[in-house]
């Protein structure tokens, strides 16, 4: 029914432009991974890399953050970089990759008991896009973020990994970011072999689960590079 | 295995008005949020008009806005796109996406919308 998706569903990914669908054998129909919303930079393909500029962390993968790729440079040019693994050094939590959080300048595990420290948190939609909520009600959505006892479900509003219950991460759906499963073997997922190359997806898919990685679909060949199926398969 | 169909497009002289009709059938499992997506001939496919169904909001590219809705019922595995004041830049291949529990993302073969001036 209706409130059982309200209350327990998540969003992925959405179709690249025409011809860059890869379609699941026996499926009727195209799985595929990624469209650009209104506004975002063109969809590339990994040969035509560039970075991707941003202004924010939300605005880049669940595996990547907003900074100036220098050293002390430029605080008007910032791109989406790699996340930083486990024991790195950070600044801030988005820095560190799913699963981690910044604690004492280091990217430290999240399942710790980590309760991060902000008591509420406030996403604002501002993209350029109208957003209409189907019962009137405010567009401005308020995110407790003092997780003490539960963490957020499958479906729930997010701002990053660490936010959602074990087993799911912080992707974009639509203009917002909720709590999505994390992909199992098998499953299609969006590679991006270059930071930043992905553009900024409207549905956007969850990282594979632990010890799988985000590989071309062997037995899945086609002319152009970028619309080969990937799937999440054993290391 | 899941399908989607769409429906409704057509010729129409501009200021007319068009509703197009998604309806996935064959599916086990539950959509997030269903979306419409156009491709007009030489341009890259765009975003329309989505609905979400976790969220309960519903989003509108700044071209369309005020002249389409979009509508569905998630129960009946359904999503409409009421299309008012019709322009010929509308014209495009209108298609249908789903976002679907098991992680893959289904959408149909399109339906053609061709604005006359």
């Known amino acids: 029914t209706l409130n059982s998706v309200l209350n327990s569903n998540a969003i992925k990914n959405l179709p690249p432009p025409l011809g860059g669908a890869a379609g699941h054998p026996g499926s009727a129909v195209s799985a595929a991974p990624g469209i650009l919303y209104p506004g975002g930079n063109k969809y590339q393909t990994i040969d035509n890399y560039q970075p991707y500029p941003c202004a924010e962390d939300e605005e880049c993968g669940t595996d990547e953050y907003c900074a100036s790729p220098t050293r002390g440079g430029d605080a008007g040019v910032q791109i989406c970089l790699a996340c930083r693994k486990r024991r790195k050094r950070c600044m801030r939590h988005a820095m560190c990759c799913p699963g981690n959080y910044c604690k004492n300048g280091i990217c430290v595990s999240s399942d710790q008991n980590h309760f991060r420290g902000e008591i509420e948190e406030t996403i604002t939609e501002s993209f350029g896009n109208d957003h209409s909520t189907l019962d009137g009600y405010s567009r401005r959505t308020t995110l407790s973020s003092k997780m003490y006892h539960t963490k957020g479900q499958e479906g729930s509003v997010c701002l990053r990994s660490s936010d959602c219950a074990s087993g799911l991460c912080c992707a974009r759906h639509f203009w917002s970011k909720i709590c999505k499963p994390v992909l199992k073997e098998g499953q299609v997922c969006t590679k991006h072999r270059r930071k930043g190359s992905h553009g900024l997806e409207i549905f956007q898919r969850c990282y594979c689960g632990e010890g799988l990685s985000c590989r071309i679909q062997k037995d899945h060949h086609q002319a152009s590079n970028s619309s080969r199926l990937h799937t999440c398969q054993r290391h | 295995e899941v399908q989607l169909v769409e429906s409704g497009g057509g010729l129409v002289q501009a200021g007319g008005s068009l509703r197009l009709s998604c309806a996935a059938s064959g599916r086990t499992f539950s959509s997030y949020g269903m979306g419409w997506f156009r491709q007009a001939p030489g341009k890259e496919r765009e975003f329309v008009a989505g609905?979400?169904?976790?969220?309960?909001?519903?989003y509108y590219a700044d071209s369309v806005k005020g002249r389409f809705t979009i509508s569905g019922d998630n129960a009946k595995n359904t999503v409409y796109l009421q299309m008012n004041s019709l322009k010929p830049e509308d014209t495009a291949v209108y298609y249908c996406?789903?976002?679907?529990?098991?992680?893959?993302?289904?959408w149909g073969q399109g339906t053609q919308v061709t604005v006359s001036s």
């Open positions: 996406a789903s976002d679907e529990s098991d992680a893959y993302n289904y």
């Open positions: 609905i979400s169904w976790t969220l309960g909001r519903t």
